[in-house]
Amino acid sequence: EINGSANYEMFIFHNGGVQILCKYPDIVQQFKMQLLKGGQILCDLTKTKGSGNTVSIKSLKFCHSQLSNNSVSFFLYNLDHSHANYYFCNLSIFDPPPFKVTLTGGYLHIYESQLCCQLKF
């Protein structure tokens, strides 16, 4: 398992909500990405492929999420001070092998200026 701080901007604020960006290498084909708040799983997204190369995307703990070819974004809305915490992107790489787990994270600071608007984006 590899642990570290995200070396990119992990938190992007929008109108009272936050987009939490969890990156993964372009070469990764199949994976599970979990968003952890402290030690608690808040959200997850799993991408796998079947024998016909058909893609399956699943969420056991559903959050609004967005998948690109090198990142998963999880969106949290209606921010308040209780959201301030350490957040971690827990990436399990299934494909290509070998199986590997990486954990990257950062602290989400909540400032008054980020609580003003409760619009969904």
Epitope: Q30, T48, G50, S51, G52, T54, S56, K58, D95, P96
Partner: antibody, heavy 117, light 111 residues
Framework: EVQLVESGGGLVQPGGSLRLSCAAS????????MDWVRQAPGKGLVWVSN????????EYSPFVKGRFTISRDNAKNTLYLQMNSLRAEDTAVYYC??????????WGQGTLVTVSS | DIVMTQSPDSLAVSLGERATINCKSS??????????LTWYQQKPGQPPKLLIF???TRQTGVPDRFSGSGSGTDFTLTISSLQAEDVAVYYC?????????FGPGTKVDIK
């Protein structure tokens, strides 16, 4: 240890039906796509069907589409193949296989289906 | 559907000698940096066993005398030093798209 055990094969008349089962153990069944692959006596391997982790995606070979239905019960760790309108050319050993992300990495011993009058 | 062909249909090789099996696909199996091509071994009376995936990566536990090579439409499985336990039928298989298909198989025997 991963184990896949097929059952339900046998002799059936043309036009008849059979339901194959595959009991899985030794791994988290609900984490994997599963497939059926068949092999006619003395012949090669032919892919039949697959199903994703929760059963929401299914795919079929053109040879069986509209006649066979794949399903799974994750609570019972069991894969199924419902075979209707069977034909003589469906005679084969049917293997249950686990799609291990980039290949069929575990196979059952197979169950023989014979379609004959 | 992608058609997989194999050559030869069968071959007999002396113990300790090299065996080479060829597989050709009717369209390229290369997507990004991966060739969606696997090799299986089937011994008499047994289910198949995964040997090689992504054209050249050995499955865990497979002896290093087995190697895979090739890209695009042309692939090769090589057994560098044939052992008695390698007598089997070998199948190539693609998972580039649906339906996945297998080659017709190549039977390997001892000369």
């Amino acid at each position: 240890e991963v184990q896949l055990v097929e059952s339900g094969g046998g002799l059936v008349q043309p036009g008849g039906s059979l339901r194959l089962s595959c009991a899985a153990s030794g791994f988290t069944f609900s984490d994997y796509w599963m497939d059926w692959v068949r092999q006619a006596p003395g012949k090669g391997l032919v892919w039949v069907s697959n199903i994703d982790e929760d059963g929401s995606i299914t795919e079929y070979s053109p040879f069986v589409k509209g006649r066979f239905t794949i399903s799974r019960d994750n609570a019972k760790n069991t894969l199924y193949l419902q075979m209707n309108s069977l034909r003589a050319e469906d005679t084969a050993v049917y293997y249950c296989t686990r799609w291990g992300r980039f290949g069929f990495d575990s196979w059952g011993q197979g169950t023989l289906v014979t379609v004959s009058s | 559907d992608i058609v997989m062909t194999q050559s030869p249909d069968s071959l007999a090789v002396s113990l300790g000698e090299r065996a080479t099996i060829n597989c050709k696909s009717s369209q390229s199996l290369l997507s990004g940096s991966f060739n969606y091509l696997t090799w299986y071994q089937q011994k008499p009376g047994q289910p198949p066993k995964l040997l090689i995936f992504y054209a050249s990566t050995r499955q865990t536990g497979v002896p290093d005398r087995f190697s895979g090579s090739g890209s695009g439409t042309d692939f090769t499985l090589t057994i560098s030093s044939l052992q008695a336990e390698d007598v089997a039928v070998y199948y190539c298989h693609h998972h580039y798209n649906a339906p996945p298909t297998f080659g017709p198989g190549t039977k390997v025997d001892i000369k």
